[in-house]
């Protein structure tokens, strides 16, 4: 999987001069057009309501960092997680929450209630996800939290926690 | 958050002559690779089936009117709603409703039982989602409609209701 | 519903020479910025667990053939199915599951328990979606698999199970 | 090298419940995920069910009411309980290694480690 | 979840190719490339001798084959030796999440 870094804003592209002076398709290939991504599933081992993630996920014109996508280049991002849950009831109901905090700040949270009937069931399977749209500056970061890491079960659904953004529009 | 528009469409932009003539990133930056987009969270005050907006969200190249995003630019483009909702269990179950209506028709629906166990309970959360991918002409309107607008908790939840378009392919 | 396709390449596009050649409008529009997409609804009657899709949907760059959407330009591509059931319930859980499979292989999965309580009710609703984030290459097929397809109401709800693609970055 | 080895009574009575034992050796039973298979004699394999390590169940649909699969991985062991045995439940009980690996995609390599066996008869 | 099917037997002379057949369902075969194949001699356990189709596990022979075909997977050994008289167990993953395996295929080597 690529995992490639966009080194230069397009202000540093010599659009006039150099080898790209006259070829418009050089020129279109370096266009303003910047494109930022990640995919990122759920690691292994989690012990703590912050979700951490495989770095070794997709990952191009964005940074992971201590459990955070840390942005690169400004602009509009769609952001969207989502998360597998299997819960072994207890005797009683279970809220099953998640949410995406932009500089540890909540900005969008999903809540769904398991287990409601109050019965000892073996498991309940429950999936949770969560979007959203926002302007993004440099270096903000964008992280998970979930009350009740313990039911994501990694060893079942190692592929199906996720993390992922993708810059919509520059912010140029 | 911005809520500018974009005030010219592309075929006013003077691609050859004007003072862009020659300065090639000038012309790609004013290329006709439209971006719109919407993201509006629910408001505060909820008295009808029909869902109003708060409009001082993120409005791009869309406008706001009378609880419907309205598409200036035709093309196609990808509709996403997401509803938190909170139910005092009665003793039955609930069926929860969102509809994603384009121009006053149903296009698309979500639907899911809560309460299932027909117990009185303190509260069960549930999140619903919709999306949708859609060629629109201008002047098309989006707008979302649920059975039990009572349920979406806008008091603990003023940020989770969401409605957001954005622009995927102009249809030039 | 527009189900044209891309008949050229980028590296067919004369950039320089023919009536092209001059007007930087023209050479915007047949620029490298390939869009790809499809929107599919199931088919009205299910028989196996793989899926069926109406092929009179939107395509776009993409071709459908035998439940498979079948990629042409290699790419990242977002994919996102979304499948509304309804369950009679029997006297046990009903866990409801939707897998996302590239080549065959499962790529990602979603469940959910439903009927929990163990009461036979009416019936049951239950929204499912998955969505992903990959490279894709060409003739890579993109299926949707169901443990329970006779829970998929294609009668009440022919419009809300859906499998869409669209490419985000091409692979240039 | 895994290596696994089946335990248990080799004789068990009409509508009395089966426990069998899987020791797993060489190997960290956190790791993968673990299968029970049977085999009357003279007949073909099927398949009981599987655990994970974080102790979730798949069971044979036929077999779901009767089977219980457990874990206790700080023996590196796993068990299989039957329930309401029969003389159609007479067969050799097998465990393996159900090897599934998750990167990109979910690779199924199959069953590819197993025990020698363990011969289970029903009878009063 | 049904059985798959596969020939009671097949047979071969030594150094021929035999071809075993297994046949299930748009649930199981026809919709993942999640197929094995296993070779069990008389009172031994069975061993893994191809997954995923057509991969081979290190230290099986390669004149071991797999592929598939719609509904039915096929096993090809070829250069027959005597040593491959047992009996062959194919087994896919069912969209249950299970594994469903054949009735079982006895290959004789003849001569």
């Known amino acids: 999987q690529r995992t490639d870094s966009i080194p230069n804003s397009p202000d540093n592209i010599p659009l006039r001069g150099g080898n790209c002076s006259e070829d418009l398709l050089c020129i279109l290939k370096r266009a303003p057009f910047k494109k930022s991504w990640a995919y990122l599933q759920v690691a292994k081992h989690l012990n703590k309501t912050k979700l951490s993630w495989n770095k070794d996920g997709i990952l191009h014109g964005v940074r992971y960092q201590d459990g955070n996508l840390v942005i690169q280049f400004p602009g509009l991002y769609f952001i969207i997680c989502q998360l597998q849950f299997l819960v072994q009831c207890p005797n009683n109901s279970v809220d099953l929450k998640l949410e995406l905090l932009i500089n540890k700040h909540i900005k969008k949270q999903a809540l769904v209630t398991v287990c409601e009937s109050g019965m000892q069931t073996k498991h309940v399977y429950q999936n949770l996800s969560q979007f959203l749209l926002d302007y993004l500056q440099v270096n903000t970061t964008v992280s998970v939290n979930v009350d009740t890491f313990q039911y994501i079960d990694t060893s079942t659904f190692p592929l199906e926690n996720v993390l992922s953004v993708f810059l919509y529009s520059n912010s140029d | 958050q911005r809520t500018d528009s974009i005030p010219n469409s592309p075929d006013n932009i003077p691609l050859r002559g004007g003072n862009c003539s020659e300065d090639l990133l000038c012309i790609l930056k004013r290329a006709p690779f439209k971006k719109s987009w919407a993201y509006l969270q629910v408001a505060k005050h909820l008295n009808k089936t029909k869902l109003s907006w708060n409009k001082d969200g993120i409005l791009h190249g869309v406008r706001y009117q009378d609880g419907n995003l309205v598409i200036q630019f035709p093309g196609l483009y990808f509709i996403i709603c997401q509803l938190q909702f909170l139910v005092q269990c009665p003793n039955n179950s609930v069926d929860l409703k969102l509809e994603l209506l384009i121009n006053k028709h149903i296009k698309k629906q979500a639907l899911v039982t809560v309460c299932e166990s027909g117990m009185q309970t303190k509260h069960v959360y549930q999140n619903l989602s919709q999306f949708l991918l859609d060629y629109l002409q201008v002047n098309t309107t989006v707008s979302v409609n649920v059975d039990t607008f009572q349920y979406i908790d806008t008091s603990t939840f003023p940020l989770e209701n969401v409605l957001s378009v954005f622009l995927y392919s102009n249809s030039d | 519903q527009r189900t044209d396709s891309i008949p050229n390449s980028p590296d067919n596009i004369p950039l320089r020479g023919g009536n092209c050649s001059e007007d930087l409008l023209c050479i915007l529009k047949r620029a490298p910025f390939k869009k790809s997409w499809a929107y599919l609804q199931v088919a009205k009657h299910l028989n196996k667990t793989k899926l069926s899709w109406n092929k009179d949907g939107i395509l776009h760059g993409v071709r459908y053939q035998d439940g498979n959407l079948v990629i042409q330009f290699p790419g990242l591509y977002f994919i996102i199915c979304q499948l509304q059931f309804l369950v009679q319930c029997p006297n046990n859980s009903v866990d409801l599951k939707l897998e996302l499979l590239i080549n065959k292989h499962i790529k990602k999965q979603a469940l959910v328990t439903v009927c929990e309580s163990g009461m036979q009710t009416k019936h049951v609703y239950q929204n499912l979606s998955q969505f992903l984030l990959d490279y894709l290459q060409v003739n890579t097929t993109v299926s949707v698999n169901v443990d329970t397809f006779q829970y998929i109401d294609t009668s009440t709800f022919p419009l809300e199970n859906v499998l869409s693609v669209f490419l985000y970055s091409n692979s240039d | 090298q895994v290596q696994l080895q089946e335990s248990g009574p080799g004789l068990v009575k009409p509508s009395e419940t089966l426990s069998l034992t899987c020791t797993v050796s060489g190997g960290s039973i956190s790791s993968y995920i673990w299968s029970w298979i049977r085999q009357p004699a003279g007949k073909g394999l099927e398949w009981i069910g599987r655990i994970y390590a974080s102790g979730n169940t798949n069971y044979n649909p036929s077999l779901k009411s009767r089977v219980t699969i457990s874990v206790d991985t700080s023996k590196n062991q796993f068990s299989l309980k039957l329930s309401s045995m029969t003389a159609a439940d007479t067969a050799v009980y097998y465990c393996?290694?159900?090897?599934?690996?998750?990167?990109?995609?979910?690779?199924?390599?199959?069953?590819?480690?197993w025990g020698q066996g363990t011969t289970v008869t029903v009878s009063s | 979840q049904s059985a798959l099917t596969q020939p009671a037997s097949v047979s071969g002379s030594p150094g021929q190719s035999i071809t075993i057949s297994c046949t299930g369902t748009?649930?199981?075969?026809?919709?993942?490339?999640?197929v094995s194949w296993y070779q069990q001699h008389p009172g031994k356990a069975p061993k893994l001798m191809i997954y995923?189709?057509?991969n081979r596990p290190s230290g099986v022979s390669n004149r071991f084959s797999g592929s598939k075909s719609g509904n039915t997977a096929s096993l090809t050994i070829s250069g027959l030796q005597t040593e491959d008289e047992a009996d062959y167990y194919c087994s896919s993953y069912t969209s249950r999440s299970t594994w469903v395996f054949g009735g079982g295929t006895k290959l004789t080597v003849l001569g």
């Open positions: 995923e189709v057509s």
């Open positions: 393996a290694r159900d090897y599934r690996v998750a990167g990109t995609y979910y690779y199924y390599y199959g069953l590819d480690v």
């Open positions: 748009s649930s199981d075969v026809g919709v993942y490339d999640y």
